[in-house]
């Protein structure tokens, strides 16, 4: 966990609040050149396990909009365009950090939250269970 | 931008810091049951575009450990186990929020940062450029 700071020049926190609460600068530093998965790639359409992106919107959260991938098929798309049901399209999930407004009506107070999002889909060989 | 709150019961921020700085409670609320990409599924092994997970560690960042997917092949794995180079294994990327310690050694002061991570791989039909 994060502990009570003793560094000079660091913002101080009261012992009773710490280690729960920290100060976060919202001037986001963006380490990416392109932030657009749809424009930077059209993998969602070209994949053998194509997916659609659905919007998940919540004004009490930052980011307030998260895009969720939903696989288009149960199976995977073959070269001829038909779906092969001997293979499975499955969502690739990622746990991400979001900021949740807490208390709800306070615009500058947040709680860190982890949520699981589906980022895209991949084609996998199914696990076959043989019955004796 | 975000401005000085006047709501009673909300943490206050000094004008000089606001709208840049907010309070964040680090007691993470986890809406998920499993947090390990390797344990939650073995898609990385069963995919026709399999990947390896590489550990990206940075003690000045929260989360300090992020798992990066690296596709194992340029092509995609066929049913017979051979690689089909007429198809491409490509990484599915997602922009995520992390907290970066700033100033660097201050444990309770952070800056929000966006980074692009590869979550897994998917098999896509290549874009063929025809030369006149």
């Amino acid at each position: 966990g994060i502990a009570i700071p003793r560094n000079s020049g660091c913002p101080n926190s009261e012992d009773k609040n710490f280690p729960r609460t920290v100060m976060v600068n919202l001037n986001i530093h963006n380490r990416n050149t392109s932030t657009n998965p749809k424009r930077s790639s059209d993998y969602y359409n070209r994949s053998t396990s194509p997916w659609n992106l659905h919007r998940n919107e919540d004004p009490e959260r930052y980011p307030s909009v998260i895009w969720e991938a939903k696989c288009r098929h149960l199976g995977c798309v073959k070269a001829d365009g038909n779906v092969d049901y001997h293979m499975n399209s499955v969502p690739i999930q990622q746990e991400i950090l979001v900021l949740r407004r807490e208390p709800r009506h306070c615009p500058n107070s947040f709680r860190l939250e982890k949520i699981l999002v589906s980022v895209g889909c991949t084609c996998v060989t199914p696990i076959v269970h043989h019955v004796a | 931008g975000i401005a000085i709150p006047r709501n009673s019961g909300c943490p206050n921020s000094e004008d000089k810091n606001f709208p840049r700085t907010v309070m964040v409670n680090l007691n993470i609320h986890n809406r998920n049951t499993s947090t390990n990409p390797k344990r939650s599924s073995d898609y990385y092994n069963r995919s026709t575009s399999p990947w390896n997970l590489h550990r990206n560690e940075d003690p000045e960042r929260y989360p300090s450990v992020i798992w990066e997917a690296k596709c194992r092949h340029l092509g995609c794995v066929k049913a017979d186990g051979n690689v089909d180079y007429h198809m491409n294994s490509v990484p599915i990327q997602q922009e995520i929020l992390v907290l970066r310690r700033e100033p660097r050694h201050c444990p309770n002061s952070f800056r929000l940062e966006k980074i692009l991570v590869s979550v897994g791989c998917t098999c896509v039909t290549p874009i063929v450029h025809h030369v006149a």
């Epitope: 963006n30 749809k38 919007r55 919107e57 004004p59 930052y62 307030s64 615009p107 | 931008g1 922009e95």
Partner: antibody, heavy 122, light 110 residues
């Protein structure tokens, strides 16, 4: 300086079409913003038309009355958002504002342009 | 669509007066309401968001309150520069996002 500048307004005949532009400066279109259009008929109130996401995904929202006749698009390389208006009617005469919604708080418009006047008349 | 009913539509007052403008939503919008000030020939200017949070640079004589369906904008002591038209604006999301504005309140000198 962070600002929005609209252009493309003018006189158009009923049934005609017009494309308005909104050039953003001082910030870059990204996943942090939604770019919107709001109009105001002479002596009347403000009316939301629609918004387009400036990052990640091609996604738009429209007021129910605007869907079909009005189309919002963007060119991120030019940091510009557009409003294509078709089958224009006299009641579309208004000042058209470009406005920004910050992804940090999507509940309000945090930046407005100065507006461009569109007059629909024969 | 959610209807935003603003009242009064016009209001006359004097410098130093306390003024209250109300906005009612046709269904609950939590506290997702903003207030704007608009002067003739100018774009709207954000005053308050999330029902009660003062926007950057806005004088403290402006305040907002309310949640659910009923909201209020109060100017504690009118200044000459406050004579303008005021609009409330809501945010709503169901299957898609929408924003709506109240009809406006024109504040003039008595």
């Amino acid at each position: 300086e962070v600002q929005l500048v609209e252009s493309g307004g003018g006189l158009v005949q009923p049934g005609g079409s017009l494309r308005l532009s909104c050039a953003a400066s001082g910030f870059s279109f990204s996943s942090d913003y939604w770019m919107c259009w709001v109009r105001q008929a002479p002596g009347k109130g403000l009316e939301w038309i629609g918004c387009i996401y400036a990052g990640d995904v091609d996604d738009t929202d429209y007021a129910s009355w605007a869907r079909g006749r009005f189309t919002i698009s963007r060119d991120n390389s030019k940091n510009t958002v557009y409003l294509q208006m078709n089958s224009l009617r006299a009641e579309d005469t208004a000042v058209y504002y470009c406005a920004r919604v910050d992804g940090f708080d999507i509940t309000y418009f945090d930046l407005w342009g100065q507006g461009t006047l569109v007059t629909v008349s024969s | 669509d959610i209807q935003m009913t603003q009242s009064p539509s016009s209001l006359s007052a004097s410098v130093g007066d306390r003024v209250t403008i109300t906005c009612q939503a046709s269904q609950t919008i939590n506290y997702w309401l903003a207030w704007y000030q608009q002067k003739p020939g100018k774009a709207p200017k954000l005053l308050i968001y999330r029902a009660s949070t003062l926007a950057s640079g806005v004088p403290s004589r402006f305040s907002g309150s309310g949640s659910g369906t009923d909201f209020t904008l109060t100017i504690s002591s009118l200044q000459p520069e406050d004579f303008a038209t005021y609009y409330c604006q809501n945010y709503y999301y169901s299957t898609s996002r929408s924003y709506g504005f109240g009809g406006g309140t024109k504040l003039t000198v008595l």
